[in-house]
Interface confidence: low
């Protein structure tokens, strides 16, 4: 960031999209201001124009390519500048020399499925969505499952420090609606954060069978 | 008020080596791209190298290639041209530019300016 009062934050999804937020104490209104990204070893550029997400803060996701494709490397280094239009120049306000491959944010795993469900127990599998084939087996997954009554923040978090996709919830309530939810983290990077959760999965557990605790 | 202050100029024999330095006050070093100009006597004035706002690239005029290097240091706010292997033809005012618009840099009317620092290089 240039100053104190400005951040400018971005992460590689590992494959063609640099998502950034950029935020500014006192910022300019209504001033057009986008990102641009220049890397150092390709050859092309690419801006995206900054949109506000709140008073103070803007976003945008730079598309670097088709979503499954390979942009960038371990070794690439990618220029990132905030530029604010002041009438006919561009002015920079923020800048960062950016490691895609120490500054990670995965997409959201997705195709979240009920592949068995019992009265206690569930099993769930999920897909990761335009991961770098780079990590290899090298991922962790967070889950996290909502029981009634209970609130997202409240539920428990279970790791898998492997690459897993699928999990079994065990000690279930007979006959009960949950939700579940899983994040997924590359062990590569720096600055590398979880990524968003996954959309939930809502499932219901087996009733009882009468007569017998099962 | 962005102010530009040079230092370092000064006489020196053909194969030398000098040193200058450009200090900007009056705003955030890091929001500018940083050049070196300069300005033989009855002749225009010429870009002689840049370096952009993060110091990751440079670029140079051709005559100059391999024998200068401008750097910069954005925690002490200066930028720098080592110029090596002085030649006669390098006698010139050197003149420090910042721009905050990078793609304009080379651009003489839209630059601040630093007051210049005189370099001489006999034979």
């Known amino acids: 960031a240039v100053n104190g009062t400005s951040q400018f934050t971005c992460f590689y999804n590992s494959r063609a999209n640099i998502s950034c937020v950029w935020s500014q104490d006192g910022a300019l209104q209504d001033t057009s201001c986008q990102v641009h990204a220049w890397p150092d070893r390709r050859r092309w550029n690419q801006t995206c124009e900054l949109l506000p997400v709140s008073q103070a803060s803007w976003a945008c996701n730079l598309i670097l390519g088709a979503p499954d494709s390979q942009k960038l490397t371990t070794v690439d280094i990618v220029t990132l500048r905030v530029l604010c239009r002041e009438g006919v120049r561009w002015r920079v306000m923020a800048i960062q020399d950016f490691k895609p491959f120490e500054n990670l944010r995965l997409m959201a795993p997705i195709s979240l499925q009920v592949v068995h469900v019992e009265t206690h127990r569930c099993n769930i599998s999920w897909e990761i969505s335009q991961a770098s084939h780079y990590f290899e087996r090298h991922l962790e997954f967070e889950a996290r499952t909502l029981s009634p009554g209970h609130t997202w923040e409240e539920a428990p978090l279970l790791t898998l420090k492997q690459k897993q996709e699928w999990i079994c919830l065990e000690t279930l309530t007979p006959d009960t609606q949950y939700e579940f939810q899983v994040r997924v983290k590359p062990l590569q990077g720096e600055f590398t954060t979880w990524s968003p959760w996954s959309q939930p999965l809502a499932f219901r557990t087996k009733p009882a069978a009468l007569g017998k605790d099962t | 008020q962005v102010q530009l202050v040079e230092s370092g100029g000064g006489l020196v024999q053909a194969g030398g080596s000098l040193g200058l330095a450009c200090a900007l006050s009056?705003?955030?070093?890091?929001?500018?791209?940083m050049a070196w100009f300069r300005q033989a006597p009855g002749k225009e004035r010429e870009f002689v190298a840049s370096?952009?706002?993060?110091?990751?690239?440079?670029d140079y005029v051709a005559s100059v290639q391999g024998r200068f290097t401008v750097s910069r240091d954005n925690n002490k706010n200066t930028v720098y041209l080592q110029m090596n292997s002085l030649k006669p033809e390098d006698t010139a005012v050197y003149y420090c530019?910042?721009?905050?618009?990078?793609?304009?840099?080379?651009?003489?009317?839209?630059?601040?300016w630093g007051q210049g620092t005189q370099v001489t290089v006999s034979s």
């Open positions: 530019a910042a721009n905050t618009d990078y793609f304009q840099i080379r651009s003489l009317d839209r630059n601040t």
């Open positions: 009056g705003d955030v070093f890091v929001r500018y791209t």
């Open positions: 370096v952009t706002d993060s110091g990751r690239t440079t």
